[in-house]
């Protein structure tokens, strides 16, 4: 049976928590990604940013999970207007910011 949206979001949060807690060396070798606007369309925007990081096993599960939340096909090099213009941050900081935002969505009951 399909996973309820609340469970899917909780699983994504859990994965991001695991990444932040288990981080020893710089996440994804310190790769930089485009910062995104967290106020709308967060799942697709996050995927559009993270999909450009390749060869980083630590975030592969996150990429797959975000893909399940995003209704359209996302490919590397694709960017929507949700990108914060010309601002790049480390993947580790991106994950932390995303986690804070998703936890707030969960607490508010915004699962979709």
């Amino acid at each position: 049976s399909p996973v309820p949206p609340s469970t899917a979001l909780k699983e994504l949060i859990e994965e991001l928590v695991n990444i932040t807690q288990n981080q020893k060396a710089p996440l994804c070798n310190g790769s930089m990604v485009w910062s995104i606007n967290l106020t709308a369309g967060v799942y697709c925007a996050a995927l559009e940013s993270l999909i450009n990081v390749s060869g980083c096993s630590a975030i592969e599960k996150t990429q797959r999970m975000l893909n399940g939340f995003c209704p359209h096909k996302v490919s590397a090099g694709q960017f929507s207007s949700l990108r914060v213009r010309d601002t790049k941050i480390e993947v580790a900081q991106f994950v932390k910011d995303l986690l804070v935002h998703l936890k707030k969505l969960f607490r508010e009951g915004q699962f979709n």
């Epitope: 609340s6 469970t7 909780k10 949060i13 928590v17 936890k103 707030k104 607490r107 508010e108 009951g109």
Partner: antibody, heavy 123, light 107 residues
């Protein structure tokens, strides 16, 4: 040391509004990941979760009682308030407040509880 | 809502015994299961959170286990101070729901 203490009217009449106060110490509701819940237990029955308020004022209610419940907080005075409108004899219970911390995973585990305050609804 | 069922409303055991209290959820709660102890004076304490994590200050004779829908609380070497009612609570989905409680008594 974390402590919570509930206070209320003790007795009130049907159709009135129940106002409860939870006064706490040992933590701050301005701290990220902190929350306070209200739970009640009617005599001889199980525990029932009523409402929750997070540090950033996100509020959640039990859907069965949502239309009658209002939760709020005064961070500076370390208090959380619960109002239950249009009370009936079925609302007679011991009312507890408790702290929730959500560091990392969202646990919804209430790690410290008040002693409870007894509320009787009677005409 | 998720229903939480504690089949035993009361249990009788002797001091020094090993006691297991069970709790069943009406659906998978993914280990978001907490155990509370309510003493006869009304004091409520968290014992175990997230199925098996011991809350600070709780004696190590308390332990929790389970997964999916079935969970249990075990008390080893039962002591007089353990006489209380024990409640399970699911923290996976709102509204939060509790089991009906299991009252532990001394034989």
């Amino acid at each position: 040391q974390v402590t919570l203490k509930e206070s209320g009217p003790g007795i009130l009449q049907p159709s009135q509004t129940l106002s409860l106060t939870c006064s706490f110490s040992g933590f701050s509701l301005s701290t990220s990941d902190m929350g306070v819940d209200w739970i009640r237990q009617p005599s001889g029955k199980g525990l029932e979760w009523l409402a929750h308020i997070w540090w950033d004022d996100v509020k959640r209610y039990n859907p069965a009682l949502k239309s009658r419940l209002t939760i709020s907080k005064d961070t500076s005075s370390s208090q959380v308030f619960l109002m239950l409108a249009s009370v009936d004899t079925a609302d007679t219970a011991t009312y507890y407040c408790a702290r929730t911390v959500s560091s990392g995973y969202i646990y919804y585990a209430m790690d410290y509880w008040g002693q409870g305050t007894s509320v009787t609804v009677s005409s | 809502d998720i229903q939480m069922t504690q089949t035993a409303s009361s249990l009788s055991a002797s001091l020094g015994d090993r006691v297991t209290i069970s709790c069943r959820a009406s659906q998978d709660i993914r280990n978001y299961l907490n155990w509370y102890q309510r003493k006869p004076d009304g004091t409520v304490k968290l014992l175990i959170f997230y199925t098996s994590k011991l809350h600070s200050g709780v004696p190590s004779r308390f332990s929790g286990s389970g997964s999916g829908t079935d969970y249990s609380l075990t008390i080893r070497n039962l002591e007089q101070e353990d006489i209380a009612t024990y409640f399970c609570q699911q923290g996976n989905t709102l509204p939060l729901t509790f089991g009906g409680g299991t009252k532990l008594e001394i034989k």
